[in-house]
C-alpha cells in the first residue's frame, strides 16, 4: 500500500548561466528509501544510493552537483535545460514514487519560482 506523497519544487524558472536546486521530499510514509534517481526526460542525471552514496552520470559531471540532501543542483544553465525533471524514489516496502518538476531557463533576468505542489 503506497501511502506516501512526494512534494516537489513544482514549476520553477531560472536564469541562463545560473544554477537551480531541484528538490523532492517524500512524506506520509515510514518506507525505507533505498535509492533516489534524478532524470531529465529519459536521461539519467544522478543516483543517490543508500549504500553507495552519489553517482553522477559522466555526461553531466561538469554541471550537476549532488545535494542538498537528496536534491540535485544544476549549474551553468542553458536554454536547452528547459524541460521536465523527475525524482524517482525507490522505497521498501511501498515501492516506487515519482515526482515531477518543470524547469524553464530564461534569457532575461526575470526568473520567478512557481508554487510548491504535491504529487500523490
Amino acid at each position: 500500500m503506497m501511502t506516501g506523497t512526494i512534494e516537489t519544487t513544482g514549476n520553477i524558472s531560472a536564469e541562463k548561466g545560473g544554477s537551480i536546486i531541484l528538490q523532492c521530499h517524500l512524506s506520509s510514509t515510514t518506507a525505507q528509501v533505498t535509492q533516489v534517481n534524478w532524470e531529465q526526460q529519459d536521461q539519467l542525471l544522478a543516483i543517490c544510493n543508500a549504500d553507495l552514496g552519489w553517482h553522477i552520470s559522466p555526461s553531466f559531471k561538469d554541471r550537476v552537483a549532488p545535494g542538498p540532501g537528496l536534491g540535485l543542483t544544476l549549474q551553468s544553465l542553458t536554454v536547452n535545460d528547459t524541460g521536465e525533471y523527475f525524482c524517482i524514489y525507490h522505497t521498501y516496502p511501498d515501492g516506487t514514487y515519482t515526482g515531477r518538476i518543470f524547469l524553464e531557463v530564461l534569457e532575461s533576468s526575470v526568473a520567478e519560482h512557481g508554487a510548491r505542489f504535491q504529487i500523490p
Partner: antibody, heavy 120, light 107 residues
Framework: EVKLVESGGGLVQPGGSLRLSCAAS????????MSWVRQAPGKGLEWVAV????????FYPDSVKGRFTISRDNSKNTLYLQMNSLRAEDTALYFC?????????????WGQGTLVTVSS | DIQMTQSPSSLSASVGDRVTITCHAS??????LSWYQQKPGKAPKLLIY???TLASGVPSRFSGSGSGTDFTLTISSLQPDDFATYYC?????????FGGGTKVEIK
C-alpha cells in the same frame, strides 16, 4: 564478461536446510544489489530475495520471509541464500541475478541456476 | 501483491510474422515493467526495461510499449532465435512479481 555461477543445490527432506552460493565475476560485485529468483519445474518465475550492494538491507516476499536469509561476502564476490524449514513447494531451480544499478528491480544478468529438490 | 497477467499463454507463429504479447498489471505500475526471454534449459535474459527501453545487445525487432496497467511486447519480424518463453515483471512495488509467461512456438 559478467558471470554468475550458482552451487549448493541438491535433494533435501522437508523441514531441512540448504545453503546456496553464487560466485560472481567480471564486474564490481560490491557495487550491485543482488537477488535470488526461483522457477519451479515447468512453471514461471518467482523473486525470493534481494540484498543491497553493501548488505545494509534485505527484502523478501511473504512466501519465504522468516525461512530464507540472503547474505553476501563482498571480499569473496559471493552471494548466499540460506534456506531453512524447507517445504515441497520450495522445489525449484534457483537463479542468482545481478540488479541494474539504475533501477533496482531489473535483473540484468542471470546465472544458469542450481536445482533444489525438497522431497521425503 | 500486484498480479501480472500475460496473454496469450502460448502462440504459434512462423518466421517473419509480427508477434504481439500483452501483459496486464492488477494496479498502476507506471512504466516500471521489464520483459525477459527464456529458452528451454537456459537462464532468462533481459530484453526490455522501463516498459520500452531496449536492453544492451537486444535486436531492434523487439519493442515494448505501455504505461499504467497495460503493456505490449512486439517482435516485428519473428526470427528462428526468437522461439522461447517471454515473461513480464513489475518493479513498482514489493514483492516484485512476474507474469505467467508466453510460450512462442513454431507453427
Amino acid at each position: 564478461e559478467v558471470k554468475l555461477v550458482e552451487s549448493g543445490g541438491g535433494l533435501v527432506q522437508p523441514g531441512g536446510s540448504l545453503r546456496l552460493s553464487c560466485a560472481a565475476s567480471g564486474f564490481a560485485f560490491s557495487s550491485f544489489d543482488m537477488s535470488w529468483v526461483r522457477q519451479a519445474p515447468g512453471k514461471g518465475l518467482e523473486w525470493v530475495a534481494v540484498i543491497s550492494s553493501g548488505g545494509s538491507y534485505t527484502f523478501y516476499p511473504d512466501s519465504v520471509k522468516g525461512r530464507f536469509t540472503i547474505s553476501r561476502d563482498n571480499s569473496k564476490n559471493t552471494l548466499y541464500l540460506q534456506m531453512n524449514s524447507l517445504r515441497a513447494e520450495d522445489t525449484a531451480l534457483y537463479f542468482c541475478t545481478r540488479q541494474d544499478y539504475r533501477y533496482p528491480y531489473i535483473m540484468d544478468y542471470w546465472g544458469q541456476g542450481t536445482l533444489v529438490t525438497v522431497s521425503s | 501483491d500486484i498480479q501480472m497477467t500475460q496473454s496469450p499463454s502460448s502462440l504459434s507463429a512462423s518466421v517473419g510474422d509480427r508477434v504481439t504479447i500483452t501483459c496486464h498489471a492488477s494496479q498502476n505500475i507506471n512504466v516500471w515493467l521489464s520483459w525477459y526471454q527464456q529458452k528451454p534449459g537456459k537462464a532468462p535474459k533481459l530484453l526490455i526495461y522501463k516498459a520500452s527501453t531496449l536492453a544492451s545487445g537486444v535486436p531492434s525487432r523487439f519493442s515494448g510499449s505501455g504505461s499504467g496497467t497495460d503493456f505490449t511486447l512486439t517482435i516485428s519480424s519473428l526470427q528462428p532465435d526468437d522461439f522461447a518463453t517471454y515473461y513480464c515483471q513489475q518493479g513498482q512495488s514489493y514483492p516484485w512479481t512476474f507474469g505467467g509467461g508466453t510460450k512462442v512456438e513454431i507453427k
